[in-house]
Structures are given as C-alpha cells and as structure tokens.
C-alpha cells in the first residue's frame, strides 16, 4: 500500500533570465528512493539515480543544474520555460509516486512564488 | 557524427595492468553524456565496467571496484580504462561506450585483449 | 544485483517470419530496459530504450514491450540482416547487467 505524498514548490513563477530551483519532497513513507525523474511536459531533463548519481539531458545540460538535494536548478529561464515540470519518484517497495509543479516565466519583475501544495 | 576508438596492447601478462584508450571524435567528452567502458568475454558474456560522466566523476561495477580506474583528458578528448592485477578471467574484447541515460547509444569497434604469459 | 535472464538462448527462423525475444529482470526495473543486436565481429548497436523507444536508424520491423520485471523484443518479417545475437540491459542501478544473450540464426 501506497501511503506516502509528495510535497512541491507549487506553483511557481520566475523572472525571465533568472533561476529558480524546482523541488519536491516525498513524506509519510519509510520507501527507499531508488530513483527521481525530472520531466517537463514529456520530455526528461534529468534523472537522479541512487546508485549512479546524476544524468542531465544533454541538450538541457548548459541551463539545468543538479540539486540542491534531488530538485533540479534551471538557469536562464525563458518563457518558454512555462509549463508543468513533474518529478516521478521511484521508490521502493511502494512503487511510483509523482509531483507537479508549475512555472511561469515573467518577462517583468514582479515574480512572486506560489503556496507549497501536497498530491497525495 | 560521433566515433569513438579504443586503442592499447593486445597482449598484457598476467598481474600487470591493462590500460586502454578511447578515442572521441566528433563530440566533445564534456558535453554531456557519460563514457563507458564494457567487456565482451569469450564466452558471449557482456560486462558493464563503470564510466567517467562529463564533469568527470566515476561509477564502477561493484565487482570491478577494488581493480578499477577511469579517468579522461580533456584536452584530448580522450577516456582511459585501467585494469589492476589482471588474469586469463580478464581476456575479452573491450568496448568503450557512449552513455544516455545509462544505456549505450554509440559504441567504439572494439579492442580484444588477450592476458597470457 | 539486479539479474538479467534472456530466453531463449538460441533461435531458428526463416526469413519472413516473426520471432520473440524475452528478457525478466529479477526485480522491479521499471521500463528501464534497453535491447541491442550484434552480428558476427561487429559491436552492439542499441535497438531500444526505456523498454519500447527504438533508437535512431532502427527499422520498425522492431518492437519493445514491456514493463516491471517482464519484457520483450519482436521481429517482424525477418530479414537477412536481422541474424545475430541479441542482448538485453537494464539501465536502472550499479551494476549496469546484460542478459546472457539470445543467438538468431537462419533456419
């Protein structure tokens, strides 16, 4: 049984140009994280496997950072950048478990972060 | 298009150590991706033997840890297996690899290494 | 470690036939599976990735399947060039295993 929530940045906004570190938190479980997926859309940025470490998307590579912790920094953010990002934790032996966060790149300066959400 | 090419001895006596060399062309080991090396034993058997990521930082087959060294050079765009203390278990034809995502999308053409004495 | 098991080790068939090639992995992969061809003194080309993807180049004669532990590779309407040996590979956690191999041979 499935008993664990994965709790994200939310909702999200940025400035274009600037950075912003997307992350999620996996609680109320005692599975093991074998593996955390980033993706935006369908397409994979990056995958943090526990055994192997990190892998970016090569064509992401030049604006997507590893990190803090199994989140995952984008850099020169651009509008097109807009969009829903999920993290898929693959865990064991509970099995898979998503978050979603979604950002939006401002062209002003008035970018404001969102309220942190839970997905059960 | 990318290539790569291993090069070394094809003969090494046993308790030396085997070094090999992959040649990159046509994309830079810095780049992304990470750079594997692979064995392929008489016998039909594949096995996977560690990588060196882009940043450089290294990953090794558990089984091979004790023995194993991957390094690069940059500046070359070259990758280098080493391979301690070696016997007749270590004759096979070794690969060297690109690596998406832990799967190998671009392989070299292959080097046989024999140990004997 | 996470086992690969390939079956069957070797397989007869005639050109224009349709053949099936399976892999289990002794636990939960995902689809975390790649399948590559070798023929006879040449090096593995990647088929498949991520169980179904096939890889650039590849003709859609082929076709992954497959999720969890259970997965497979189908030719269809086999073509002089498709005999050779068949590996699959998890890409999933340390170490990186291959299956022992499934040999294709021409009937």
């Known amino acids: 049984m499935m008993t664990g929530t994965i709790e994200t940045t939310g909702n999200i906004s940025a400035e274009k140009g600037g950075s912003i570190i997307l992350q999620c938190h996996l609680s109320s479980t005692t599975a093991q994280v074998t593996q955390v997926n980033w993706e935006q859309q369908d397409q994979l940025l990056a995958i943090c496997n526990a055994d192997l470490g990190w892998h970016i998307s090569p064509s992401f590579k030049d604006r997507v950072a590893p990190g803090p912790g199994l989140g995952l920094t984008l850099q020169s953010l651009t509008v097109n950048d807009t969009g829903e990002y999920f993290c898929i934790y693959h865990t064991y032996p509970d099995g898979t478990y998503t978050g979603r966060i979604f950002l939006e790149v401002l062209e002003s300066s008035v970018a404001e972060h969102g309220a942190r959400f839970q997905i059960p | 298009d990318v290539q790569l090419q291993e090069s070394g001895p094809g003969m090494v006596k046993p308790s030396q150590s085997l070094s090999l060399t992959c040649t990159v062309t046509g994309y830079s080991i810095t780049s992304g991706y990470d750079w594997h090396w692979i064995r392929h034993f008489p016998g039909n058997k594949l096995e996977w033997m560690g990588f060196?990521?882009?940043?450089?930082?290294?990953k090794y087959n558990p089984s091979l840890k004790s023995r194993i060294s991957i390094t690069h050079d940059t500046s070359k765009n070259h990758f280098f297996l080493k391979l301690n203390s070696v016997t007749s278990e270590d004759t096979a034809t070794y690969y060297c690899a690109r690596g998406s995502y832990w799967y190998f999308d671009v392989w070299g053409t292959g080097t046989t290494v024999t140990v004997s004495s | 470690d996470i086992q690969m098991t390939q079956s069957p080790a070797s397989l007869s068939a005639s050109v224009g036939e349709t053949v099936t090639i399976t892999c289990r992995a002794s636990e939960n992969i995902y689809s975390y599976l790649a399948w590559y061809q070798q023929k006879q003194g040449k090096s593995p080309q990647l088929l498949v990735n991520n169980a179904k993807t096939l890889a650039e180049g590849v003709s859609s004669r082929f076709s992954g399947s497959g999720s969890g532990t259970q997965f497979s590779l189908k030719i269809n309407s086999l073509q002089p060039e498709d005999f050779g040996s068949y590996y699959c590979q998890h890409h999933y956690g340390n170490p990186l295993m291959f299956g022992a191999g499934t040999k294709l041979e021409l009937k």
């Open positions: 060196i990521s882009d940043s450089g930082s290294t």
